[in-house]
């Protein structure tokens, strides 16, 4: 029998390389059975995850999964960092793994670096 617990399918140690000025959608894949849980996004500040209030979010439904989306319109240099989604389910909080956004300012980069370079060259990134 398949579990009816809520599950948040953000991959462990995942990251996204994005560019300031571009639009971006950060997706939190959510599996649930009967009732869709309340889901929120937060941004890590040290060991504390600060809830993101007043941001544009939406839901997308696919066959076996729903996605709670955080919209960046557009991406700002200050959006660099790690994010986590969490679901409120039966009075319990289920937290996802964090996913990291590496934001490059295209004005300071002569060419867009490769996806792997983004993760391995922190001096390109905003802290």
């Amino acid at each position: 029998k398949e579990s009816c617990d809520v599950q948040l399918y953000i991959k462990r140690q995942s990251y996204h390389s994005i560019f300031a000025g571009d639009p971006f959608k950060l997706e939190c894949p959510v599996k649930y059975c009967a009732h869709r849980p309340q889901v929120t996004w937060c941004k890590l500040n040290g060991t504390t995850c600060v809830k993101l209030e007043g941001r544009h979010t939406s839901w997308k439904q696919e066959k076996n999964l729903s996605f709670f989306i955080l919209h960046f319109e557009p991406v700002l240099p200050s959006d660099n960092g790690s994010y986590r989604c969490s679901a409120n389910f039966l009075s319990a909080i289920i937290e996802s793994h964090s996913t990291t956004l590496y934001v490059t300012d295209v004005k300071s980069a002569s060419e867009r670096p490769s996806k792997d370079e983004m993760a391995s060259r922190p001096w390109l990134l905003y802290s």
Epitope: Q7, Y9, K11, R12, S17, K115, D116
Partner: antibody, heavy 120, light 112 residues
Framework: QVQLQESGPGLVKPSGTLSLTCADS????????IHWVRQPPGKGLEWIGR????????RYNPSLKSRVTISSDKSKNQASLKLSSVTAADTAVYYC?????????????WGQGTTVTVSS | DIVMTQSPDSLALSLGERATINCKSS???????????LNWFQQKPGQPPKRLIY???KLDSGVPDRFSGSGSGTDFTLTISSVQAEDVAVYYC?????????FGQGTKLEIK
């Protein structure tokens, strides 16, 4: 049942490029990470790198980073490894492996491996 | 890079004896999520590695309970309580906490 199968030329000339493919059946590669690992004859295991096929993002072993490229094709449900400027030291069995999700986050399914010999 | 050092390099035991393989990492393997991604693999000749233990001590499904794992931080141990003929293999520890991922050099288990 997850099944991984590596394929590619068994013989590569020195200074050439080693190209291997990992075909996946039984799951969508976008749901997980695909890793490449190699094992020289009679020696231990060396992690080469991994790819997130959902977005193409990679992480590589710094000792190989300048020569290695891992890519994926979601439509074919497969991942690929390219290693350039090969020498005899790159002779090894090359494995692709799947990283499963919660709660393991480890290499749970491996291909049988393909032997690549670098020789003229 | 995280260096994983296994000891001993090889081990020859009689059937029924207890096998202990140690693995020491050069940095703590405790991840930011509070978990320790230390795994043990078994590799038999001509075969790919097979996962035995994940998260330090959790036994993979189908693995006999004579296998166990323990440890924390930087020091870890794989124990086979009573060695059987089918346990002849090379055993590797592997860390999945830091990049690059790294394996121990392997410990070869033989029967006397």
């Amino acid at each position: 049942q997850v099944q991984l199968q590596e394929s590619g030329p068994g013989l590569v000339k020195p200074s050439g490029t080693l190209s291997l493919t990992c075909a996946d059946s039984g799951f969508s590669i976008s749901d997980t990470y695909i890793h490449w690992v190699r094992q020289p004859p009679g020696k231990g295991l060396e992690w080469i790198g991994r790819i997130d096929p959902a977005n193409g993002f990679t992480r590589y072993n710094p000792s190989l980073k300048s020569r290695v490229t891992i890519s994926s094709d979601k439509s074919k449900n497969q991942a690929s490894l390219k290693l350039s400027s090969v020498t005899a030291a790159d002779t090894a069995v090359y494995y692709c492996a799947r990283e499963d999700g919660y709660p393991y986050y480890t290499l749970d399914s491996w291909g049988q491996g393909t032997t690549v010999t670098v020789s003229s | 890079d995280i260096v994983m050092t296994q000891s001993p390099d090889s081990l020859a035991l009689s059937l029924g004896e207890r096998a202990t393989i140690n693995c020491k990492s050069s940095q703590s393997l405790l991840d930011v999520d509070g978990k320790t991604y230390l795994n043990w693999f078994q590799q038999k000749p001509g075969q790919p590695p097979k996962r035995l233990i994940y998260l330090v001590s959790k036994l993979d499904s189908g693995v006999p309970d004579r296998f166990s794992g323990s440890g924390s931080g930087t020091d870890f141990t794989l124990t086979i309580s009573s060695v059987q003929a089918e346990d002849v293999a090379v055993y590797y520890c592997w860390q999945g906490t830091h990049f690059p991922r790294t394996f121990g050099q392997g410990t070869k288990l033989e029967i006397k």
